[in-house]
């Protein structure tokens, strides 16, 4: 039975040109995490495999950095980075857990005036 839950940063915003850390945390399970995938809509950004380490998609290598931890750092943000991001935890023996984060990239002036999503 899958007892775990994924906690995420929820809905977040960041400034255009800035960076943001996407973080998920798996709790309430003793399952072993074997791999974490980070996806943007249907695009695979990066994988962290327990045995093989990190692999960043070459298409995103210049703007995506591994970590901290099992998280992912997005850099040089553009408005096109706005959208849904998913952390997919592969675990043994539970199976797959998925968390969702919505990122809105704002023009600097808007972000400076404090327009922010609340984390639920």
């Amino acid at each position: 039975m899958m007892t775990g839950t994924i906690e995420t940063t929820g809905n977040i915003s960041a400034e255009k040109g800035g960076s943001i850390i996407l973080q998920c945390h798996l709790s309430s399970t003793t399952a072993q995490v074997t791999q974490v995938n980070w996806e943007q809509q249907d695009q695979l950004l990066a994988i962290c495999n327990a045995d093989l380490g990190w692999h960043i998609s070459p298409s995103f290598k210049d703007r995506v950095a591994p970590g901290p931890g099992l998280g992912l750092t997005l850099q040089s943000l553009t408005v096109n980075d706005t959208g849904e991001y998913f952390c997919i935890y592969h675990t043994y023996p539970d199976g797959t857990y998925t968390g969702r984060i919505f990122l809105e990239v704002l023009e600097s002036s808007v972000a400076e005036h404090g327009a922010r999503f609340q984390i639920p």
Epitope: T34, Q35, L44, N49, A50, I56, S57, P58, K61, G95
Partner: antibody, heavy 117, light 107 residues
Framework: EVQLQESGPGLVKPSETLSLTCAVS?????????WHWIRQPPGKGLEWIGF???????VYNPSLKGRVTISHDTSKNQFSLKLSSVTAADTAVYYC??????????WGQGTTVTVSS | DIQMTQSPSSLSASVGDRVTITCRTS??????LAWYQQKPGKVPKLLIY???TLAEGVPSRFSGSGSGTDFTLTISSLQPEDVATYYC?????????FGQGTKLEIK
């Protein structure tokens, strides 16, 4: 178009070190992907040896760990394999390959290495 | 290590036939399975990755399916140029391992 080409001695004596190089053209090995070595003994299946990342960190097959070293020279856009203390069981066609999320999308033509005295 | 078992080890089929090759893994690899084609005397060529995604330039008669521990490569209508040995490979952990191969011949 990305191309990989293996080179190195075709004959190695038992107990010596096998050394091979993979020259990459059409793509910079420091720009992403992983860079793998795979071998195929005569008439047999494929065995993965290990890889080097664009950053220079390496991952090896535990069955060969201690005997294998993979390195790269980004200035020459090539990466290399060294396999020490070889025996006849290391006789194989050795392939270099480009890895994307740990599958292999581009392969070299392969080079045959025979271990014999 | 994750063990990969392909079946059959060899098979003979006629042009136009539907051909199925299976690959079973010793533990759950989710969808992280690739298939390669190696023609006699040639280099292996990536056909499919992530169980069902066709590599660039691969004919649509090839397809993949499965998840967990059981996977299938299907050729919907066998062509003479499909004579080859086919290998499965998991891309999920260390060591990366291949199946022992399935040799496909034309009747």
């Amino acid at each position: 178009e990305v191309q990989l080409q293996e080179s190195g001695p075709g004959l190695v004596k038992p107990s010596e070190t096998l050394s091979l190089t993979c020259a990459v053209s059409g793509y910079s090995i420091s720009s992403g992907y992983d860079w793998h070595w795979i071998r195929q003994p005569p008439g047999k299946g494929l065995e993965w040896i290990g890889f080097i990342r664009d950053s220079g960190s390496t991952v090896y097959n535990p069955s060969l760990k201690g005997r294998v070293t993979i390195s790269h020279d980004t200035s020459k856009n090539q990466f290399s394999l060294k396999l020490s203390s070889v025996t006849a069981a290391d006789t194989a066609v050795y392939y270099c390959a480009r890895g994307l999320f740990w599958y292999f999308d581009v392969w070299g033509q392969g080079t045959t290495v025979t271990v014999s005295s | 290590d994750i063990q990969m078992t392909q079946s059959p080890s060899s098979l003979s089929a006629s042009v136009g036939d539907r051909v199925t090759i299976t690959c079973r893994t010793s533990e759950n690899i989710f969808s992280y399975l690739a298939w390669y084609q190696q023609k006699p005397g040639k280099v292996p060529k990536l056909l499919i990755y992530n169980t069902k995604t066709l590599a660039e330039g691969v004919p649509s008669r090839f397809s993949g399916s499965g998840s967990g521990t059981d996977f299938t490569l299907t050729i919907s209508s066998l062509q003479p140029e499909d004579v080859a040995t086919y290998y499965c490979q998991h891309h999920y952990g260390n060591p990366l391992t291949f199946g022992q191969g399935t040799k496909l011949e034309i009747k």
